[in-house]
Interface confidence: low
């Protein structure tokens, strides 16, 4: 057991820089994936930089499956927003796929084989949860 | 930065119970994979219990690729041995695939989609490194 000391991340999470990441082992729609992250005191993946993107691309390099991230929009006339309400920085990546489709449950972004796609939020996919690493001694 | 305190596992590794695990992002033959783990002060994956197996199966559930583990044998008349020289406990899992083949480079075991297979060690695959977690305060 770790004495007098909190680990940067809980068991089964990956610690990278200032964040902890958890790759889900089940497949759910976007809203359910979001709930699962929230229940772990986390949010769905937010990519802030090309370094973040590089890390995630590398971490899923041995998977051909899609992973929901915390990026969505109501319909094509709305902007892409992260869960915290901040907009997507357009230089980070280009969103492919169903970008001009309108779905009742909204349009959500997933990452697959290094590329980001727009898709119907009601579909089931794996997901990536993210939270701040604990980088202070307790 | 973590003060007065060592994290159980380095960045990018997954901490689970008493061990740290790293899923390689490149694909190499078994010997090269072994060298890469050694360079990180680790060994290729060793499965000691059904709990270990359950964790690994879950951790690779979103991949359809093979991952080398630290289990090999010179030829079919030799026993399966882990890198530390200990024999495989037969109740843990059944090895499928090329179990009766003889290869110049030996026969190595990989895990893929929850099952363990025997294959020519010269082939390239992803791999899983493992080392003891640091569970003491520094």
């Amino acid at each position: 057991r770790v004495a007098n000391c909190s680990a940067p991340c809980p068991q089964d999470w990956i610690w990278h820089e200032e964040n902890c990441y958890l790759f889900s082992t089940g497949s759910f729609n976007w809203e359910k994936s979001q709930e699962k992250c929230l229940s772990l005191d986390a949010k769905l993946l937010k990519i802030n930089s090309t370094a973040d993107l590089d890390f995630i691309q590398q971490a899923i390099s041995y998977s051909s499956f899609p992973f929901w991230m915390g990026l969505s929009r109501r319909n094509p006339s709305y902007p892409w927003l992260w869960e915290d309400g901040s907009p997507l920085m357009p230089h980070l990546f280009r969103i492919r796929g169903a970008v001009s489709q309108t779905y009742p449950s909204g349009t959500c972004a997933y990452i697959q084989r290094g590329a980001v796609y727009a898709e119907n939020c009601i579909l089931a996919a794996f997901s990536i949860c993210q939270k701040k690493a604990n980088l202070r001694a307790q | 930065r973590v003060a007065n305190c060592s994290a159980p596992c380095p960045q990018d590794w997954i901490w689970h119970e008493e061990n740290c695990y790293l899923f390689s992002t490149g694909s190499f033959n078994w010997e090269k994979s072994q060298e890469k783990c050694l360079s990180l002060d680790a060994k290729l994956l060793k499965i000691n219990s059904t709990a270990d197996l359950d964790f690994i199966q879950q951790a690779i559930s979103y991949s359809s690729f093979p991952f080398w583990m630290g289990l090999s044998r010179r030829n079919p008349s030799y026993p399966w041995l882990w890198e530390d020289g200990s024999p495989l406990m037969p109740h843990l899992f059944r090895i499928r695939g090329a179990v009766s083949q003889t290869y110049p480079s030996g026969t190595c075991a990989y895990i893929q989609r929850g099952a363990v297979y025997a294959e020519n060690c010269i082939l390239a695959a992803f791999s899983i490194c493992q080392k003891k977690a640091n569970l003491r305060a520094q």
Partner: antibody, heavy 129, light 111 residues
Framework: QVQLVQSGAEVKKPGASVKVSCKVS????????MHWVRQAPGKGLEWMGG????????HVSQKFQGRVTMTEDTSTDTAYMELSSLRSEDTAVYYC??????????????????????WGQGTTVTVSS | QSVVTQPPSVSGAPGQRVTISCTGS?????????VHWYQQLPGTAPKLLIY???NRPSGVPDRFSGSKSGTSASLAITGLQAEDEADYYC???????????FGGGTKLTVL
């Protein structure tokens, strides 16, 4: 490009079992939702069972529960459907089918939205005494 | 008896427009599950014609269109051609049955 190749025609006696295979190429089986549908002579399509994205497992249609077993051999990327206690009304063409999604990437469970765009060639099963 | 119903047959002259209805219930089409349409030419395996209520896979002519409203869906074929003579099936998911359901099929005859 996903392809599904099924086993050949079978003639069976009433009470026997039949096991139809469906070999996947172009993808791995675990990336796909596999379903089984049959069509009796001159009749419509009937869903027998397949992968259910609601709980991420295979479901068998209530009509066939207890008689249909769906299995997968991931080492050979082959799906199997076994129908037991055969009767004459089981004479039909049996199809395996799957969905590859908009990007053609074969993602399990997405057939909810995309429908079944890849079908096997069909296996004729004749039950006759 | 299918839980999703289609008319057994429809017909039309070349160049005409025909529609095929697909009526479900609150546990399938009415629950928001998408409807897919398949075309089966004589002696061949069915082919996906419309997915997600109204989307055409690549290679399907724009003469074919789908729509959905409430517990029903419909397939429309405009500019009818002789090669459209086939059986057409709708399909949806049914939550009460925990499985896929097909309509009974509609035979389209081009007069």
């Amino acid at each position: 490009q996903v392809q599904l190749v099924q086993s050949g025609a079978e003639v069976k006696k009433p009470g026997a079992s039949v096991k139809v295979s469906c070999k996947v190429s172009g993808y791995t089986l675990t990336e796909l939702s596999m379903h089984w549908v049959r069509q009796a002579p001159g009749k419509g399509l009937e869903w027998m069972g397949g992968f259910d994205p609601e709980d991420w497992s295979n479901h068998v249609s209530q009509k066939f529960q207890g008689r249909v077993t769906m299995t997968e051999d991931t080492s050979t990327d082959t799906a199997y459907m076994e129908l037991s206690s055969l009767r004459s009304e089981d004479t039909a063409v049996y199809y395996c089918l799957t969905s590859t999604g908009r990007q053609g990437k074969g993602v399990r469970g997405w057939d909810y939205y995309y429908g079944m765009d890849v079908w096997g060639q069909g296996t004729t099963v004749t039950v006759s005494s | 008896q299918s839980v999703v119903t289609q008319p057994p047959s429809v017909s039309g002259a070349p160049g005409q427009r025909v529609t095929i209805s697909c009526t479900g219930s609150s546990s399938n089409i009415g629950a928001g599950y998408d409807v897919h349409w398949y075309q089966q030419l004589p002696g061949t395996a069915p082919k996906l014609l419309i997915y997600g209520n109204s989307n055409r896979p690549s290679g399907v002519p724009d003469r074919f269109s789908g729509s959905k409203s409430g517990t029903s869906a419909s397939l429309a074929i405009t500019g009818l051609q002789a090669e459209d003579e086939a059986d057409y099936y709708c399909q949806s998911y049914d939550s009460s049955l925990s499985g896929w359901v097909f309509g009974g099929g509609t035979k389209l005859t081009v007069l």
